[in-house]
């Protein structure tokens, strides 16, 4: 194949791959007709002048996962056909000026996972055809104005996982074709007004895992094509009323892990394509009327692990498509009887780990399709007569870890539970808290010295018990989860939740069993 170096493999398709620790310099002679060259996992520490001079037809060059720390300015001379260049996963601290000069066809430049300390406008001034620039995983502390001014055709720019503390409002101003901008995992504390104004074609903006405290009111007003906006794990304490008003294409918005205290009515929207909204791990204390009213297509709403103590009766107005609502691990003591009235298509609701003392008898009156209700670990002593009677699809009801008062008033609930025992699951059953002489006894089999009619246990809906977000190992019968610290541990602390007892769906989603696919 026109002379293949012994330490490389060369294919008929003009592809050359050179790998192995024994390689300490660019192998020679390389086949003159090579179109793709990969130099991977070697001990090459530097690239000298023109090592690729005789392979001018090269289209793709990957020099990845080496010990590369130094490159001569003329290293890529004569590669005018090169479209793809990756120097990712090396040890580069400095890029020589002019390194990419002459690479007139270059479309993708990957410099990620190095140790680059700075970039300058002169670095990329010759790369006018560049479409993708990957700079994530370096040590960049700032981006100078003009750094990207010549990259007018750029569609994807990744600056994530650096050490950026601020961004100049002018640095992206010429990137009118940019579709993806990633700035995640930096140290940004604020984004100046106007920073994204020139990005009229932007579709994805990743700002998660920074230290952003405030969002300017008009920060996204020119980004009408934005589809995915990641703002999670920042320090955002409030949302300006108009900040999301001009984002009609948005279909993903993450705001979890911030310091949001309140949400103003209509803050979200109109966003006709948004189907999931994650607001867990904030400091939200109340939900006013119409706060989500623009989210007509929302299917999943996660409000768990906040400090919600009050929900206005019209808070969920407009959420006609909602299937799953997670309100667990908040500070709810009471709920208005009409609060869920508009949620006609709700299938799953998680209310566990609150301070609910009672529930209105009509709380689920219009939510006829409910399949799963999580009410464990509250302050419930009894429930109104017939509260679940109309819920023909209910196949999971969790009532344990409540201070049930087992006097004669408990009989209607007890009888219903006896009839519907399979719906309670097998993990933990509700037990009496008072009076003292029956404390700890199962609510279902308790004898309250009142005649109880014999019952026939009917078949419950055969909907599979499919745990959701994430899947849950069964609790040991002897374990109470009401005081476990894992209940509020952040989801990001663990990867495979299926192996961890208790740190399950009750941590964020609070959805178990009958969740839809």
């Amino acid at each position: 194949y026109h002379g293949c170096p012994s330490e490389c493999t060369c294919s008929r398709a003009s592809q050359v791959e050179c790998t192995g620790a024994r390689i300490v310099a660019v192998p020679t002679p390389l086949p003159w007709n090579a179109m793709s060259l990969q130099i991977l996992n070697t001990h090459i520490t530097e690239l000298n002048e023109s090592p690729f001079l005789n392979i001018s037809a090269l289209i793709a060059l990957r020099i990845e996962k080496n010990e590369l720390s130094r490159i001569t300015p003329g290293a890529f001379r004569n590669l005018g056909s090169l479209r793809y260049l990756s120097l990712a996963n090396n040890k580069l601290q400095v890029l020589p000026i002019g390194l990419f000069q002459g690479l007139d066809s270059l479309e993708s430049l990957l410099l990620s996972s190095n140790q680059l300390l700075q970039i300058q406008p002169a670095h990329f001034s010759q790369c006018s055809n560049l479409k993708e620039l990957q700079l994530h995983g370096n040590h960049l502390e700032y981006i100078p104005d003009g750094a990207f001014d010549h990259l007018v055709g750029l569609t994807k720019l990744n600056l994530g996982k650096n050490s950026l503390t601020h961004i100049s409002p002018r640095v992206f101003q010429h990137l009118g074709n940019l579709q993806v901008l990633r700035l995640y995992e930096n140290r940004l504390t604020d984004i100046p007004m106007g920073t994204f104004d020139g990005l009229v074609n932007l579709q994805e903006l990743a700002l998660q895992q920074n230290q952003i405290g405030l969002l300017s009111p008009g920060l996204f007003h020119n980004n009408h094509n934005l589809q995915r906006l990641y703002l999670s794990n920042n320090h955002i304490s409030q949302l300006p009323p108009s900040v999301f008003m001009q984002l009609p294409q948005l279909n993903r918005l993450t705001l979890f892990g911030n310091s949001l205290k309140e949400l103003s009515p209509g803050i979200f929207g109109p966003m006709p394509n948004l189907r999931e909204l994650w607001l867990y791990d904030n400091h939200i204390s109340s939900l006013p009327d119409n706060v989500f009213s623009n989210l007509r297509q929302l299917q999943v709403l996660i409000l768990s692990r906040n400090q919600i103590s009050f929900i206005s009766p019209g808070a969920f107005n407009g959420l006609t498509e909602l299937r799953e609502l997670s309100l667990h691990t908040n500070a709810l003591q009471d709920l208005d009887g009409n609060v869920f009235r508009m949620l006609a298509n709700l299938q799953n609701i998680s209310l566990q780990n609150n301070r609910l003392r009672q529930l209105p008898g009509n709380i689920f009156a219009n939510v006829n399709g409910l399949m799963a209700i999580q009410l464990q670990n509250n302050q419930l002593e009894n429930l109104p007569l017939g509260i679940f009677d109309h819920l023909g699809k209910l196949c999971e009801l969790r009532l344990y870890d409540n201070p049930w008062r087992c006097d004669s008033d408990i009989l209607p609930l007890r009888n219903w539970l006896l009839l519907n025992q399979p719906r309670l699951g097998t993990d933990t059953v509700p037990v009496c808290f008072s009076p003292a002489n029956v404390r700890g006894q199962s609510l279902i089999i308790i004898n309250v010295n009142v005649a109880v009619p014999s019952v026939h246990v009917p078949e419950v809906p055969s909907y599979p018990e499919t745990p959701w977000y994430p899947d849950t190992p069964s609790y040991p019968d002897t374990t109470s989860v009401s005081s476990t610290t894992e209940l509020t541990s952040p989801v990001e602390d663990y990867t495979d939740l299926t192996t961890i007892q208790v740190t399950d769906d009750r941590s964020v989603w609070g959805m178990t069993q009958a969740q839809s696919g």
């Epitope: 189907r275 999931e276 899947d471 990001e492 939740l497 769906d505 839809s516």
Partner: antibody, heavy 119, light 110 residues
């Protein structure tokens, strides 16, 4: 270009286990739901479950609970499905697929992995 | 689980003619604004390919001779003018509850 590339065909003995991989590229792996679907020879499609890499959450069809275990490795953007205690009725083509939102359709599919269980 | 019944099991249609496939759900899979029903095409030796999502929304890149309609329990996939490359098995799928698929309809050329 969005791609889901699955591992090669496997022939296994009854009672053993198999782990099928699904390497994702061309999209932000953690931002999509990864579904697994079974297709027995000459049969239709059966949903096994899904994994959401963003929070590490898994959901199973009750029928496959205890049979299939879904995991992901976000560092390599790879999803895995392990099937245990294999029996002849587990002989099938297994597909991974991507979904944008939880209730959305599966818009991209892997090429499938054939698992044959035979003594 | 929700049972999806497809009809017919197989269908032979002349090139350029209309092909219609039905899918009936054992319970409603629709709200006032959405139907949680999707359609896939599967050719021999290949994975399924998404054609229609949410009952009537054509997936990007799918020829507009494919269309979907219906709500509640009854849904239809229509190929307005059958082409040779449309020979395949077609499946409906619901995502209202635990996902289930129809048994498939085999479309052939007459």
């Amino acid at each position: 270009e969005v791609q889901l590339v699955q591992s090669g065909a496997e022939v296994k003995k009854p009672g053993s286990s198999v782990k099928v991989s699904c390497k994702a590229s061309g999209f932000t792996f953690t931002d999509y739901y990864i579904h697994w679907v079974k297709q027995a020879p000459g049969q239709g499609l059966e949903w096994i479950g899904l994994h959401y890499p963003y929070i590490g959450g898994t959901n199973y069809n009750q029928k496959f609970k205890g049979k299939a275990t879904l995991t992901v490795d976000t560092s390599t953007t790879t999803a895995y499905m392990e099937m245990s205690s294999l029996r002849s009725e587990d002989t099938a083509v297994y597909y991974c697929a991507r979904g944008d939102n939880k209730y959305d359709a599966m818009d991209y599919w892997g090429q499938g992995t054939t698992v044959t269980v035979s003594s | 689980d929700i049972v999806l019944t497809q009809s017919p099991d197989s269908l032979a249609v002349s090139l350029g003619e209309r092909a219609t496939i039905n899918c009936r759900a054992s319970q409603s899979v629709s709200t006032s604004s959405y139907s949680y029903m999707h359609w896939y095409q599967q050719k021999p030796g290949q994975p399924p390919k998404l054609l229609i999502k949410y009952a009537s929304s054509l997936e990007s890149g799918v020829p507009d001779r494919f269309s979907g309609s219906g709500s509640g329990t009854d849904f239809t996939l229509t190929i307005s003018s059958l082409q040779a490359e449309d020979v395949a098995v077609y499946y409906c799928e619901q995502s209202w509850e635990i996902r289930t698929f129809g048994g498939g309809t085999k479309v052939e050329i007459k």
